[in-house]
Interface confidence: low
Amino acid sequence: SGVFQLQLQEFANERGVLASGRRCEPGCRTFFRVCLKHFQAVVSPGPCTFGSVSTPVLGTNSFAVGDDSSGGGRNPLQLPFNFTWPGTFSLIIEAWHAPGDDLRPEALPPDALISKIAIQGSLPVGQKWLLDEQTSPLTRLRYSYRVICSDNYYGDSCSRLCKKRNDHFGHYVCQPDGSLSCLPGWTGEYCEQPVCLSGCHEQNGYCSKPAECICRPGWQGRLCNECIPHNGCRHGTCSTPWQCTCDEGWGGLFCDQDLNYCTHHSPCKNGATCSNSGQRSYTCTCRPGYTGVDCELELSECDSNPCRNGGSCKDQEDGYRCLCPPGYYGLHCEHSTLTCADSPCFNGGSCQERNQGASYACECPPNFTGSNCEKKVDRCTSNPCANGGQCLNRGPNRVCRCRPGFTGAHCELHISDCARSPCAHGGTCHDLETGFVCTCPAGFSGRRCEVRIPTEACASGPCLNGATCYTGLPPDNFVCNCPYGFVGSRCEFPVSMPPSFPW
């Protein structure tokens, strides 16, 4: 939207004659008709597509035209348009003689035309006036013209509407080309988005006014860049909200289970090596010469049970001595004088002769060991259960009792709750140490994304007869996808009963 302005400055018709050559009596009472139209390489007759305007009588024969000239005429003449300025135009200015006061075309004699000028060309929008002078054999017209945009219209073609505002819908002023210039503290296509506190996390924080940083659920801190861990998380941190990722040495849902007793309590004495063996449990590997759960006891040399086959140990100044039972000899009573005839195998072991009966070997039943099957096997000593599983001896077998979330003979397998695809409507499943959590797509919520959140136009359930509702563009539109047998914008008509239209 804009205005073509034409400023008539001076008209000269010294001889006071009409275009036909006839003289005006007593002089040519001159008024102007202006026709503005689209660009024509050749300006030809036809509608004034961009507008037309007439002046009152401005003078007789030769005269200057002042600004806002008397007689009710406006100078400059205004030709408003409400379309995109094309940048080109054709202009026809006709000077007419008015013998009387009635200036309507039908009231004038057919030869009342004094002169007619036609120009065309390109004309960019701008404040600058273009000065032109057109002469004919009998007349001369000096005038200037320009195109300016209406209030709130901008750009080369006055096609960009821009109205400065500072309210809920935007906070901006307008640039000369019609683009928006946001007020300080605002951004976005229409400057409707506040610029949050510098550094405020893009996803985790937001603001409703400039320089603010309001944290979304699960986030905290001045810049909303610190996640809030699971409520009750003791020795853990998070990288996303409600997580509880345990610090080293801690376990359990709330990271309150001590898995690194060694580091936290240093229970092993006398330079022993500590190994964590489960929650609040540990094993000390003693240095030579020490014993006890925590290696707190100094060993006598007999403490290592060096005497075999039931030999008894005696401490001596320079070491120890083994007192062997009947049938055994050697430094550690390791040699036997027994044969199978002496029934040396305990606990149901079977005796096998060796060296033509001069010696023997015992084959032990399950759960027993030793050269005479004298020792019971503890199958749990090797800590066979992974992931904090508890080892139990069950007759000849050992069994691992697994912690929640683990399975397998050795508790080596993690049970994935996500394997069952528990999240509905395309939700993404995340395994936790105990259980799972679903991240839901837009429009769904609930532990398993099973709850549909109504959105926009479809929220009111406009579609009938089991039709599916789709939100359209803009979001306050909807489209109903009708099931077989129904028609209508809301699937309200059965096919067998067509709607009655009013035409």
Partner: antibody, heavy 114, light 106 residues
């Protein structure tokens, strides 16, 4: 400056439909009309039809039953569709700015042959 | 439909001569007649519009005139580059019509 450019197939089978596009730049086709003119090899100019600024159309009486003109003002394009082509429709097809016909495209040669 | 009868169909003239081509309209078409020159392999070029007005960039040796429903194109002081085919066109009432053309050789 004002420019017109015709585009379309150079060869069309007899009885098939011809589709041509005239792309106009430098001027708005929602204000100015565009006409199609053709010229068989070695012959004179024939006005085929025009589509005016307001979207209305006029056609050459002899071609009216086969010819259809349309436009897409957003793309500044005018379209010609003519069906049931015969060998005598072989010609250079021009688009031109209606009015004084003061701007013309370079033309596109369409040959109707099997 | 309005008919335009153009004559002659062809003519040959020498350098610096004057030639006139005419177009007779079957109805009154006012000044809504234009003249075009077409050279081999080129698009037509506007010479005269509104029956008598010279188009921009056209040499002043070309001129147009009207007498009732007869329209004339006059070329004075013929030049080599004036070789071509000349057409008249009425755009007073659709369907618009061209004259049959006049082939000018220098």
């Amino acid at each position: 400056q004002v420019q017109l450019k015709e585009s379309g197939p150079g060869l069309v089978q007899p009885s098939q439909t011809l589709s041509l596009t005239c792309t106009v730049s430098g001027i708005s086709i929602s204000i100015y009309g565009v006409s199609w003119v053709r010229q068989p090899p070695g012959k004179g100019l024939e006005w085929m039809g025009g589509i005016w600024g307001d979207g209305s159309t006029d056609y050459n009486s002899a071609l009216k039953s086969r010819l259809s003109l349309s436009r897409d003002t957003s793309k500044s394009q005018v379209f010609l569709k003519m069906n049931s082509l015969q060998t005598e429709d072989t010609a250079i097809y021009f688009c031109t700015l209606s009015g004084d016909f003061d701007y013309w495209g370079h033309g596109v040669l369409v040959t109707v042959s099997s | 439909d309005i008919q335009l009868t153009q004559s002659p169909a062809s003519l040959s003239a020498s350098l610096d001569e004057i030639v006139t081509i005419t177009c007779q309209a079957s109805l009154d078409i006012g000044n809504w007649l234009a003249w075009y020159q077409q050279k081999t392999g080129k698009s037509p070029q506007l010479l005269i519009y509104g029956a008598t007005s010279l188009a921009g960039g056209v040499p002043s040796r070309f001129s147009g005139s009207r007498s009732g429903t007869q329209y004339s194109l006059k070329i004075s002081k013929l030049q080599v580059e004036d070789t071509g085919i000349y057409y008249c066109l009425q755009h007073y009432r659709a369907p618009f019509t061209f004259g049959s053309g006049t082939k000018l050789e220098i």
